[in-house]
């Protein structure tokens, strides 16, 4: 049993450690950037390729605030949603809705999270509580994974991959509320 994902009142999916969120069906965040990434070498022929590295999928960047109970992160975090079908890198369209998706006739390739990073966020809470900290696990990159009929959905989570190292450097020190802490300035999370 890992850290669970839960929904807050705004129905935002908040991934906690150890559980990987499914990409939302639709993103309406105006800060979302659509980029085709993870391109590999183009295949000799679209129907002959067998190497997963020859496929590519989209990484959608979006920002959101992390919430925990009544608390919210001082700053938004940026993470990726792995989106769309996988196809040969050279045939991937550059924008959603343009071009025609290439679909392999044999095995299915899915765009799934590849690496994760944990980020420490400073939480601001109502009612005068001192800021406190939480770590959220965020998708750092996406990859194409070849699925055969023997694969099931649970294997898409790819639990074996190692999280990318979060950014280094001293971060502010969260303190629970105390006489001293009440006077402390709220510091940035990162």
């Amino acid at each position: 049993q890992g850290w669970q994902a839960f929904k807050n009142d705004a129905t935002e999916i908040i991934p906690e450690l150890g559980e990987y969120p499914e990409p939302p069906p639709e993103l309406e965040n105006n800060k979302t950037m659509n980029r085709a990434e993870n391109g590999g070498r183009p295949p000799h022929h679209p129907f002959e390729t067998k190497d997963v590295s020859e496929y590519s999928c989209r990484e959608l960047h979006f920002t959101r605030y992390v919430t925990d109970g009544p608390c919210r992160s001082a700053k938004p975090v940026t993470e990726l949603v792995c989106s769309g079908q996988c196809g040969p890198a050279r045939l991937l369209p550059n924008a959603i809705g343009r071009g025609k998706w290439w679909r392999p006739s044999g095995p299915d390739f899915r765009c799934i999270p590849d690496r994760y990073r944990a980020q420490r966020v400073q939480l601001l809470c109502p009612g005068g509580e001192a800021p406190r900290a939480r770590k959220v696990r965020l998708v750092a990159s996406c990859k194409c994974k070849r699925l055969t009929r023997f694969h099931n959905q649970s294997e898409l989570k790819d639990f074996g991959t190692e999280a990318a190292r979060p950014q280094k450097g001293r971060k502010p020190r969260p303190r629970a509320r105390s006489a001293k802490a009440n006077q402390a300035e709220l510091e940035n999370a990162y």
Epitope: A118, R132, A133, R134, A163, R165, K168, R173, A176, R177
Partner: antibody, heavy 118, light 107 residues
Framework: QVQLVQSGAEVKKPGASVKVSCKVS????????QHWVRQAPGKGLEWMGW????????EYASKFQGRVTMTEDTSTDTAYMELSSLRSEDTAVYYC???????????WGQGTTVTVSS | DIQMTQSPSSLSASVGDRVTITCRAS??????LAWYQQKPGKAPKLLIY???TRWSGVPSRFSGSGSGTDFTLTISSLQPEDFATYYC?????????FGGGTKVEIK
């Protein structure tokens, strides 16, 4: 599967130090906050402190300040708690716990019994 | 330090009973309250956090409520595996402190 496996029981003399280890598996230790909680025989739970293995940040209960040191080895995903100047009142089961916040304890180790006796 | 007072310190109940345990904080802790279950010789397990949010995998018969200084853990229909000691814990102010525990025994 999240697991925390602690080192074995220890018997120490008053004035000595003890170092308890806690091996974390199921996720990288640097992605968490590590907590230590103790429980004297037949008594309740007592929080000792937390640390952030990623940056070495720590917060200790004032009762243990100056006597406790919490460290981690991120290469082996192991947390350590060292308590010095032991007295008989330090006889307890020491638990490591981990979580994604500084204020709750999501997963716990099995506990390490430390007996302080002359 | 914030004192957490649990009552009762022990209770006897039968399988199927509705059990209520209360926890009172010596000062306002908002909703920074967690509940843990501990069985003899075992480590505690997180049941409830944020006063009322069930932890992953915890059965729905466990529920928490309250804010400020008064909190309640309710087991709607006691099961054989629920006989244990229950602790509340405040996460509002350092040092974090636990209640003295409530032992739920078989009647």
């Amino acid at each position: 599967q999240v697991q925390l496996v602690q080192s074995g029981a220890e018997v120490k003399k008053p004035g000595a130090s003890v170092k308890v280890s806690c091996k974390v598996s199921g996720f990288p230790i640097k992605d968490t906050f590590q907590h230590w909680v103790r429980q004297a025989p037949g008594k309740g739970l007592e929080w000792m402190g937390w640390s952030d293995p990623e940056i070495g940040d720590t917060e200790y209960a004032s009762k243990f300040q100056g006597r406790v040191t919490m460290t981690e080895d991120t290469s082996t995903d192991t947390a350590y708690m060292e308590l010095s100047s032991l007295r008989s009142e330090d006889t307890a089961v020491y638990y490591c716990a981990t979580g994604d916040t500084t204020y709750k304890f999501d997963f716990w180790g099995q506990g390490t019994t430390v007996t302080v006796s002359s | 330090d914030i004192q957490m007072t649990q009552s009762p310190s022990s209770l006897s109940a039968s399988v199927g009973d509705r059990v209520t345990i209360t926890c009172r904080a010596s000062q306002d802790i908002h909703t920074y309250l967690a509940w843990y279950q501990q069985k003899p010789g075992k480590a505690p397990k997180l049941l409830i956090y944020w006063a009322s949010t069930r932890w992953s995998g915890v059965p729905s018969r466990f529920s928490g409520s309250g804010s400020g200084t008064d909190f309640t853990l309710t087991i709607s229909s006691l099961q054989p595996e629920d006989f244990a000691t229950y602790y509340c814990q405040q996460g509002d102010t350092l040092p974090y402190t636990f209640g003295g525990g409530t032992k739920v025994e078989i009647k």
